[in-house]
């Protein structure tokens, strides 16, 4: 805590200027008003006070607003809001896109690099918590806003705050958004991707749906195998395996078109490995490509899941 | 890639004008506030000034007179505007972006500076 001191005679500031980057903390805490500070932040920003004047100046506003920041202060907080701890912005309410904006805009430039951060900073994570529950979902706007400055945003959120994205939010949605994704994600993104894209025709349809289908059930994989889509082997490495194991081996070779020749290459893996212990060797013969694990002819195939549902 | 690339140094005469460029790439130039900062040989770094994304400058008070700063945001590209150079405004000038992170402020880009070297 600075201690409270006269302010000398002659340096009261009567703006935010340069000039006050040459006052030490104690002069800073006694000739800066806190409400011309708050009416003139956005001045801060270009201005290089450091880490420690800083800190004076986030108490004259903590001092001002114990009961958190109004909107027009946070939107001009500038570098000043790297300091700000979660527990600061637990206390705001960010109504305005244009003020998340500006705040990721500040962290973008802290964490600057070639590739957008992943995960946000805690102190990030908690303003766009703050945003999104202040919003009640997350509509496209903040959707497109998030995946610009995070694309791994979307795979950070639980399955339970994921069921709030609207469909209609899932068209701001780009592939690379959902490269960290797991499966429990794509379930509940899924659905949605497929309410959303529902009135498009079948080769666009695929396009948009195609990064969703970590999370299809084996019907959807079934009847998009009746629409030549020509899956890529990467697309189908990361389908769900119990998705893939009802599927026969004439299912799987319209679902991959060409692409078939590439389960060679992953029969050791899942889901392929699994599937192909699913299938008659027979049945797997007539890919001819040399795919070996097949239950060999004359095996009677007892679906132990049926029997046990049964009894 | 965050890049600064300084431009415009040399030999200049006393009492002579100069005017510095720095191109900036690898970010969204017209968000920040940018920086000029200079280095004389054998002392520290000294603030020149700044501009903000909308053009509202900040200068060092010793050095308002004689500076001004401005900057192109269509050609990503920030200047530095030096009137009535003397002796001691030989230096490396630098354009840098200054921020900060939860436990220091800096200036955390940097371009490789351009040399000005006041001489008759």
């Known amino acids: 805590e600075v201690e409270k001191t006269a302010c000398p005679s002659g340096k009261k500031a009567r703006e935010i200027d340069e000039s006050l980057i040459f006052y030490k903390k104690w002069e800073l805490e006694a000739c800066v008003d806190a409400a011309l500070l708050a009416t003139q932040m956005d001045r801060v920003n270009a201005i290089p006070f450091t880490y420690e004047q800083l800190d004076v100046l986030k108490h004259k506003l903590d001092e001002l607003y114990p009961q958190g920041y109004p909107e027009s202060v946070i939107q001009h907080l500038g570098y000043l809001f790297l300091k700000m701890s979660p527990e600061d912005i637990r206390k705001w309410n960010v109504t305005s896109l244009e003020t998340l904006k500006a705040l990721l805009e500040v962290n973008k430039g802290h964490e600057m690099s070639p590739q957008a951060p992943r995960r946000p900073l805690p102190q990030v994570a908690t303003l766009i918590d703050r945003f999104v529950k202040g919003r009640g979902q997350l509509d496209k706007d903040t959707l497109d806003t998030l995946t610009a400055f995070y694309p791994g945003y979307l795979c950070s959120l639980s399955p339970e705050e994921l069921s709030s994205v609207p469909p209609s939010s899932i068209w701001a949605v780009r592939p690379q958004d959902l490269d960290t994704c797991d499966p429990r994600q794509l379930d509940v993104l899924y659905p949605k991707a497929r309410l959303a894209f529902q009135n498009m025709n079948g080769s666009e349809y695929f396009v948009k749906i195609q990064s969703f289908l970590g999370g299809a059930p084996t019907e959807d994989l079934k009847a998009l195998s009746q629409q030549n889509v020509s899956m890529d082997l990467a697309t189908f490495m990361k389908l769900r395996t119990d998705a893939v194991l009802p599927l026969t081996v004439a299912e799987v070779q319209k679902l991959l078109g060409p692409h078939v020749e590439g389960l060679k290459a992953e029969e050791r893996h899942r889901p392929v490995r699994d599937w192909i212990l699913r299938q008659r060797q027979d049945d797997l013969d007539t890919l001819g490509l040399g795919l070996q694990g097949g239950i060999p002819n004359g095996y009677l195939v007892l679906d132990l899941s049926m029997q046990e549902a049964l009894s | 890639e965050v890049q600064l690339v300084e431009s415009g140094g040399g030999v200049v005469q006393p009492g002579r004008s100069l005017r510095l460029s720095c191109a900036a790439s690898g970010f969204t130039f017209s968000s920040y506030a940018m920086h000029w900062v200079r280095q004389a040989p054998g002392k520290g770094l000294e603030w020149i000034g700044s501009?903000?994304?909308?053009?509202?400058?900040y200068y060092n008070p010793s050095l308002k007179s004689r500076v001004s700063v401005s900057r192109d945001n269509a050609k990503n590209t920030l200047y530095l505007q030096m009137d009535s150079l003397r002796a001691e405004d030989t230096a490396m000038y630098y354009c840098?972006?200054?921020?900060?992170?939860?436990?220091?402020?800096?200036?955390?880009?940097w371009g490789q500076g351009t040399l000005v070297t006041v001489s008759s």
């Open positions: 840098a972006k200054y921020g900060c992170s939860s436990i220091s402020c800096s200036f955390d880009y």
């Open positions: 501009i903000r994304h909308d053009g509202n400058t």
